[in-house]
């Protein structure tokens, strides 16, 4: 469950739950920082807008960054 | 299956101090944000603190901040409240509920039974 | 601070009537952060609804969640003897407090 916050992390909880890349409207990286320590991802989904926080360590998650970062590829001229 | 376990409350003087334990079974306890609500005798419910997943967010209710602090022991399944400078009107039931993580806000998704917290001289 | 009023304070049904709950909130809530429970006597609290309108797992279809802005609902639209309980409405903003409407007490007529 991400909470909005100017400063600390965002991501209350974290998901394990491997996404579909087709359902995502968005999918935010945002690196530690002096705000927060830890590398937070943030998936929006293309049904209601819904976000999730994922969580970086899972294998699912993994494969799903790799599967956007190849289609972004495939993507870029 | 999935479960909250409260232990700890019981009959306290006023400005002694209490640890309430959650103990947690049944799902991945490391990925959850987890709640402290309690509800005083006949009345509504209270929301007094939320911890991250990880233990580096953690916010309270303005009755309780100073007094009390939330933490957790992800290695032991276990949500904690150390209540100091207890007051009367923090006689309640205390519930630990767990932040359902599988989406932006799904609500408090598994309770436990409750432990009593009484303070009287 | 988010403050949320429920109304009304009782509401005295008989079974398979019709049952709608309001929750008003202080200031604009965005749906995705409104959720509804229900609270039997000597029970812990119940998640019904998520998002305003998203039912929880395992929860009857006769549950129903509505409404946008300030403006909630709970909506139960056949009263079964076990929906006679409390029914709180929480709100989960952009900042704590996560605060409770003080309940609605749906009993039998």
């Known amino acids: 469950v991400p909470l909005s916050r100017t400063v600390r992390c965002t991501c209350i909880s974290i998901s394990n739950q491997p996404v579909n890349p087709r359902s995502l409207e968005k999918l935010e990286i945002i690196p530690a920082s002096q705000f927060c320590p830890r590398v937070e991802i943030i998936a929006t989904m293309k049904k209601k807008g819904e976000k999730r926080c994922l969580n970086p360590e899972s294998k699912a998650i993994k494969n799903l960054l790799k599967a956007v970062s190849k289609e972004r590829s495939k993507r870029s001229p | 299956q999935v479960q909250l376990v409260e232990s700890g409350g019981g009959v306290v003087q006023p400005g002694r101090s209490l640890r309430l334990s959650c103990a947690a079974s049944g799902f991945t306890f490391s990925n959850c944000g987890m709640h402290w609500v309690r509800q005083a005798p006949g009345k509504g419910l209270e929301w007094v603190a939320l911890?991250?997943?990880?233990?580096?967010?953690?916010y309270y209710a303005d009755s309780v901040k100073g007094r009390f602090t939330i933490s957790r022991d992800n290695s032991k399944n276990t949500l904690y409240l150390q209540m100091n400078s207890l007051r009367a009107e923090d006689t309640a039931v205390f519930y630990c509920a767990r932040d359902w993580p599988e989406g932006y806000y799904n609500g408090m998704d598994v309770w436990g039974q409750g432990t009593t917290v009484t303070v009287s001289s | 601070e988010i403050v949320l009023t429920q109304s009304p304070g009782t509401l005295s049904l008989s079974p398979g009537e019709r049952a709608t709950l309001s929750c008003r909130a202080s200031?604009?809530?965005?749906?995705?952060?409104l959720a509804w429970y229900q609270q039997k006597p000597g029970q812990a609290p119940r998640l019904l609804i998520y998002g305003a309108s998203s039912r929880a797992t395992g929860i009857p279809d006769r549950f129903s969640g509505s409404g946008s802005g300030t403006d909630f609902t709970l909506t139960i639209s056949r009263l079964e003897p076990e929906d006679f309980a409390v029914y709180y409405c929480?709100?989960?903003?952009?900042?704590?407090?996560?605060?409770f409407g003080p309940g609605t007490k749906v009993d039998i007529k």
């Open positions: 200031q604009s809530v965005s749906s995705s952060y």
């Open positions: 929480q709100q989960y903003g952009s900042s704590p407090p996560f605060t």
């Open positions: 911890i991250g997943y990880d233990g580096i967010n953690e």
